[in-house]
């Protein structure tokens, strides 16, 4: 089943993507593009990292996590309806045809009309790991917090062992995680 990532107009959207570096600081180039992952590289690139740093980014797109530890999740600031669509996270692993590519579907909803004038908290701060899974019955919203007790390698291992289960889909799609090395 498809997993959708949701945000409201004016909020920040979060699209998760992870890899586990083979060794600390041993980074892999990553690109984010608007639109489905092409066969090679990323189309319509919005952000790119190299072996050391973020070397290209465009307005409103940034990495909020620690990309030096493999958290290359994309934050899109102050989203509009036009930001809806597929985004590509491509982890450009060295070697022959080793790239891992993940298509992530972002759905932007119109902002809710709130009668009370309470100030809305920043979406990413309030819900740093939010995803909506589509399964039986109504959509369920899950928050994974900041995953304090599970490291990326464990997520990757769990997802590999349980790839066909719903848990695996939730883990993988909430952290499109691969292990390198």
């Amino acid at each position: 089943s498809e997993v959708e990532y949701r945000a409201e107009v004016g909020q920040n959207a979060y699209l998760p993507c992870f890899y586990t570096p083979a060794a600390p600081g041993n980074l892999v180039p990553v690109c984010w593009g608007k639109g489905a992952c092409p066969v090679f590289e990323c189309g319509n690139v919005v952000l790119r990292t190299d072996e050391r740093d973020v070397n290209y980014w465009t307005s409103r797109y940034w990495l909020n996590g620690d990309f030096r530890k493999g958290d290359v999740s994309l934050t899109i600031e102050n989203v509009t309806l036009a930001d809806s669509g597929i985004y590509c996270c491509r982890i450009q692993i060295p070697g022959i045809m080793n790239d891992e590519k993940f298509n992530l579907k972002l759905v932007i909803k119109p902002a809710k009309v709130t009668p009370a004038p309470t100030r809305q908290r920043d979406f990413t701060a309030a819900f740093p790991r939010m995803l909506t899974t589509r399964g039986h019955g109504p959509a369920e919203t899950q928050t994974l917090g900041s995953l304090p007790d599970i490291n990326l390698t464990q997520i990757s291992t769990l997802a590999n062992e349980l790839r066909d289960s719903r848990l695996a889909n939730d883990l993988r799609d909430s952290g499109a995680t691969i292990r390198i090395g």
Epitope: G35, A36, P38, V39
Partner: antibody, heavy 119, light 112 residues
């Protein structure tokens, strides 16, 4: 307007190296991927390989040991070298553009050049 | 490598009549986001191939809307609602999800 034009010898001897050049216009090799596809006489299409806009190369595993794709961005040209050719490499060779998005995979092709491998 | 199999290998159609070509892949061409990496190309006699359909069901630039593509997973179909004389040629499906990219054997469309 986008154009790709193949050039190179039409006849290559067995065991020698086939060398073709594709000259492009209307786009930059640093913004688009380019590659090669071949078609033996009366047969279907076979993907050979590609050089991405970033300069990475990907090759068909069946040909990888024999194939090299390079580019010269200053001349708007890229090339194909296929070593140790046999009669099975006789084909029309097309250069192609990969538009870097899913909508534009092989969106432009050269007209093709026939290469015969024979002694 | 992913093997692409087309049927039929040839068909003859009266102008104005519909035509359908099937393509099957040895592995799924759809990913977890529902993106299906299946392409259709047409090679007219004496010409280079041209892109008809991308991602299984999307029309390429300048392609007439009498062409349509459908399918997901491993089974795909190209349909021409009303065949015209200019549609003659060889139709190829191609998978674009894994390297090496691979094509079907081709289906030759002729006009009766």
């Amino acid at each position: 307007q986008v154009q790709l034009q193949e050039s190179g010898p039409g006849l290559v001897k067995p065991s020698e190296t086939l060398s073709l050049t594709c000259t492009v216009s209307g786009f930059s090799l640093t913004n688009y991927g380019v590659g090669w596809i071949r078609q033996p006489p009366g047969k279907g299409l076979e993907w050979i390989g590609i050089m991405t806009s970033g300069g990475s190369t990907y090759y068909n595993s069946a040909l990888r040991a024999r194939v090299t794709i390079n580019r010269d961005t200053s001349k708007n040209q890229f090339s194909l070298k296929l070593s140790s050719v046999t009669a099975a490499d006789t084909a029309v060779y097309y250069c192609t553009r990969d538009g870097t998005t899913v909508e534009t995979l092989f969106d432009y092709w050269g007209q093709g050049t026939m290469v015969t491998v024979s002694s | 490598d992913i093997v692409m199999t087309q049927t039929p290998l040839s068909l003859s159609v009266t102008p104005g009549q519909p035509a359908s070509i099937s393509c099957r892949s040895s592995q799924s061409l759809s990913d977890s986001a529902g993106i299906t990496y299946l392409y259709w190309y047409l090679q007219k006699p004496g010409q280079s191939p041209q892109l008809l359909i991308y991602l299984a069901s999307n029309l390429g630039s300048g392609v007439p809307d009498r062409f349509s593509g459908s399918g997901s997973g491993t089974d795909f179909t190209l349909k021409i609602s009303r065949v015209e004389a200019e549609d003659v040629g060889v139709y190829y499906c191609m998978q674009g999800i894994h390297v090496p990219l691979t094509f079907g054997q081709g289906t030759k469309l002729e006009i009766k």
